[in-house]
């Protein structure tokens, strides 16, 4: 058993049928010595008397808010949550496996640049009685500071019969140098509590590996005289690290017909312009990627050929 | 990645082309190592990230773009010293800091070159003959060093009398390649920045 926060305790249980569970001793936070009784949640049934209460915690029915009273007055509370260990592996019931970029990915994180600011998100099908708290650091043995905001519900979508909820959090490394070569990964830890179930999820990454630039901005077409060709031009996104000559991007320019089956013409360039043939009803899209470290491509920025 | 290879024009900062080749070569070598050593811990998540140049050179600090010198987090360990000649210095206006930067890059390359050559000698003794260093990568390191053209003491190749532990050598190779790739990215960024300046 360990304390999650004041008066909230997590009981770790080896979770299998007929498991013996864990013996827990609760102590009433009071100078009083006698006349103390204990109850669980809203029930008025007295579970025991005395300054301490010993319970065998086996299942969720044994978890909840234990309260000690004296003469009708509440003295203190202890909330017990359960953390299930199933065959040596902590349960992951609360969050959905996003399966990207690999199986068992519960937290996904992205950064728009090298400033040390990043966003993480996760999915769940649970809509109520759910709380998250997020902590982060650079390295784990001698951790350096990363400050995270509160997790917020950022999207809701319907998936088949289920509603899916996306939560996200923004974090900022306290003293980040965009040009630094990372040797210690960023660690992100999310505590999730659903009703009386506690779970924790972690992700470890280097900012360089989660970079995903914003799409190029100001995408424009300039027709070339007496030609089917157009000059496409764009700019670096505002959110990208500066100076751009140091934090350079490379670009992919794509000409896509109306039909998805039509052959796509693609050109790769380090410049912020390219000359392409603009077909009727086609659209031109440009995306960006760090020129020197191949992390994710940005989403496409698009304009119609017409 | 299907990127066209840029051919530098003659007036271009002479080292940019070499640094692009370096990054390409080390990235290819790392990919090859990951595939060949699939049963060894060779991914970014599995290895310890060590920097053999730590406390010996200060490339990131010495090569910091002017725009980032205002960022206090980037100025934790700025050091000044090093040699100040070199053929990449295209104009007399080149500052002391630029010379310092390029000489730091040269020292990095020299240290990695020695490590890689020592490691290759060990790998050649492996009865499994599982993996060797790409000669192209070693050649590209050499070319960039020549283009930087700093006069510096030659570091003797380390020789070891004891029987090599091939498992440890291959893990060390992965660690070295990951670190060298990160340094090659920094070198490319620096060359691109200097070229634009």
């Amino acid at each position: 058993i360990w304390e999650l926060k004041k008066d909230v305790y997590v009981v770790e249980l080896d979770w299998y049928p007929d498991a013996p569970g864990e013996m827990v001793v609760l102590t009433c936070d009071t100078p009083e010595e006698d006349g103390i009784t204990w109850t669980l949640d809203q029930s008025s049934e007295v579970l025991g008397s005395g300054k301490t209460l010993t319970i065998q915690v086996k299942e969720f029915g044994d978890a909840g808010q234990y309260t000690c009273h004296k003469g009708g007055e509440v003295l203190s509370h202890s909330l017990l949550l359960l953390h299930k260990k199933e065959d040596g592996i902590w349960s992951t019931d609360i969050l959905k496996d996003q399966k990207e970029p690999k199986n068992k990915t519960f937290l996904r994180c992205e950064a728009k640049n090298y400033s040390g600011r990043f966003t993480c998100w996760w999915l769940t099908t649970i809509s109520t009685d759910l709380t998250f708290s997020v902590k982060s650091s650079r390295g784990s043995s001698d951790p350096q500071g990363v400050t995270c905001g509160a997790a917020t519900l950022s999207a809701e979508r319907v998936r088949g019969d289920n509603k899916e909820y996306e939560y996200s959090v923004e974090c900022q490394e306290d003293s980040a140098c965009p040009a630094a070569e990372e040797s210690l990964p960023i660690e992100v830890m999310v505590d999730a509590v659903h009703k009386l179930k506690y779970e924790n999820y972690t992700s470890s990454f280097f900012i360089r590996d989660i970079i995903k630039p914003d799409p190029p901005k100001n995408l424009q077409l300039k027709p070339l005289k007496n030609s089917r060709q157009v000059e496409v031009s764009w700019e670096y996104p505002d959110t990208w690290s500066t100076p751009h000559s140091y934090f350079s991007l490379t670009f992919c320019v794509q000409v896509q017909g109306k039909s998805k089956r039509e052959k796509k013409d693609r050109v790769f360039t380090d410049k912020t312009s390219a000359t392409v043939i603009c077909r009727k009803n086609a659209s031109i899209s440009v995306r960006a990627q760090d020129r020197y470290y191949s992390s994710s491509w940005s989403e496409w920025a698009s304009v119609p050929c017409s | 990645r299907n990127l066209p290879v840029a051919t530098p024009d003659p007036g271009m900062f002479p080292c940019l082309h070499h640094s692009q080749n370096l990054l390409r070569a080390v990235s290819n070598m790392l990919q090859k190592a990951r595939q060949t050593l699939e049963f060894y811990p060779c991914t970014s998540e599995e290895i310890d990230h060590e920097d053999i140049t730590k406390d010996k050179t200060s490339t990131v600090e010495a090569c910091l773009p002017l725009e980032l010198t205002k960022n206090e987090s980037c100025l934790n360990s700025r050091e000044t010293s090093f040699i100040t000649n070199g053929s990449c210095l295209a104009s007399r206006k080149t500052s002391f800091m630029m010379a310092l930067c390029l000489s730091s890059i040269y020292e990095d390359l020299k240290m990695y070159q020695v490590e890689f050559k020592t490691m290759n000698a060990k790998l050649l003794m492996d009865p499994k003959r599982q993996i060797f260093l790409d000669q192209n990568m070693l050649a590209v390191i050499d070319e960039l060093m020549q283009a930087l053209n700093f006069n510096s003491e030659t570091v003797p190749q380390k020789s070891s009398l004891e029987e090599p532990d091939f498992y440890k050598t291959k893990i060390k190779l992965c660690i070295l390649l990951h670190a060298f790739r990160i340094r090659a990215v920094t070198i490319d960024r620096v060359m691109s920045y200097l070229n634009a300046s």
Epitope: D14, W15, E59, E86, D87, G88, I89, D93, T125 | -
Partner: antibody, heavy 115, light 112 residues
Framework: QVQLVQSGGGVVQPGRSLRLSCAAS????????MHWVRQAPGKGLEWVAF????????YYADSVKGRFTISRDNSKNTLYLQMKSLRAEDTAVYYC????????WGQGTMVTVSS | SYVLTQPPSVSGTPGQRVTISCSGG????????VKWYQQLPGTAPKLLIY???QRPSGVPDRFSGSKSGTSASLAITGVQAEDEADYYC????????????FGTGTKVTVLG
């Protein structure tokens, strides 16, 4: 004490269907994940499928994906394995078992796929 | 499709020490716990070892498990006639959990 009693095995022709059941007692069935494991005659153990305690997630071995469906009825304390498009290579003793560091197995039920 | 490799058979005389190996990889035994089962003819498997080296109550202490790197082993010190059975190791793969990975199985024969 924990008990898992299996039923539903038998002889079936290739291409036909069969449903296996596993009745649980002696524990809170709705709190635990459950597996199906099979063993072809004279062969080793092979995992078939898993279902979470609440039925929200199901996992299958590649060899049965798209043909077998694992399900549970927590109100009846019963686990099921619906097997469709059966093949000769599905012939095996099928076991249900609880998920956890200490596990309990059903007695096994024989499924023979033969024409 | 078996990723965990065991020797097909091992044998020993009563009282001898018998060991069975189970070889896997970094993503299974290397990073997950291992179980061992005993299966007597015509019966369901019985758990002998969980969590690499833990014995459930009721399992004789002549059975012991260990794990090192990407391999695990089961030792029977002072093997007895009633130990003649098939033995299976089981683990998970970190990418496909909760799918169970079973070893190929080892037939233990007690001679004499």
């Amino acid at each position: 004490q924990v008990q898992l009693v299996q039923s539903g095995g038998g002889v079936v022709q290739p291409g036909r269907s069969l449903r296996l059941s596993c009745a649980a007692s002696g524990f809170t069935f709705s709190s635990y994940g459950m597996h199906w494991v099979r063993q072809a005659p004279g062969k080793g153990l092979e995992w078939v499928a898993f279902i979470r305690y609440d039925g929200s997630n199901k996992y299958y071995a590649d060899s049965v994906k798209g043909r077998f469906t694992i399900s549970r009825d927590n109100s009846k304390n019963t686990l099921y394995l619906q097997m469709k498009s059966l093949r000769a290579e599905d012939t095996a003793v099928y076991y249900c078992k609880t998920h956890g560091s200490h596990d309990n197995w059903g007695q096994g039920t024989m499924v023979t796929v033969s024409s | 499709s078996y990723v965990l490799t065991q020797p097909p058979s091992v044998s020993g005389t009563p009282g001898q020490r018998v060991t069975i190996s189970c070889s896997g990889g970094r993503s299974n035994i290397g990073s997950q716990t291992v179980k061992w089962y005993q299966q007597l003819p015509g019966t369901a498997p019985k758990l002998l070892i969980y969590g690499n080296d833990q014995r459930p109550s009721g399992v004789p202490d002549r059975f012991s498990g260990s794990k090192s790197g990407t391999s695990a082993s089961l030792a029977i010190t002072g093997v007895q006639a009633e130990d003649e059975a098939d033995y299976y190791c089981q683990s998970y793969d970190r990418g496909t959990h909760p799918a169970l990975l079973f070893g190929t199985g080892t037939k233990v024969t007690v001679l004499g």
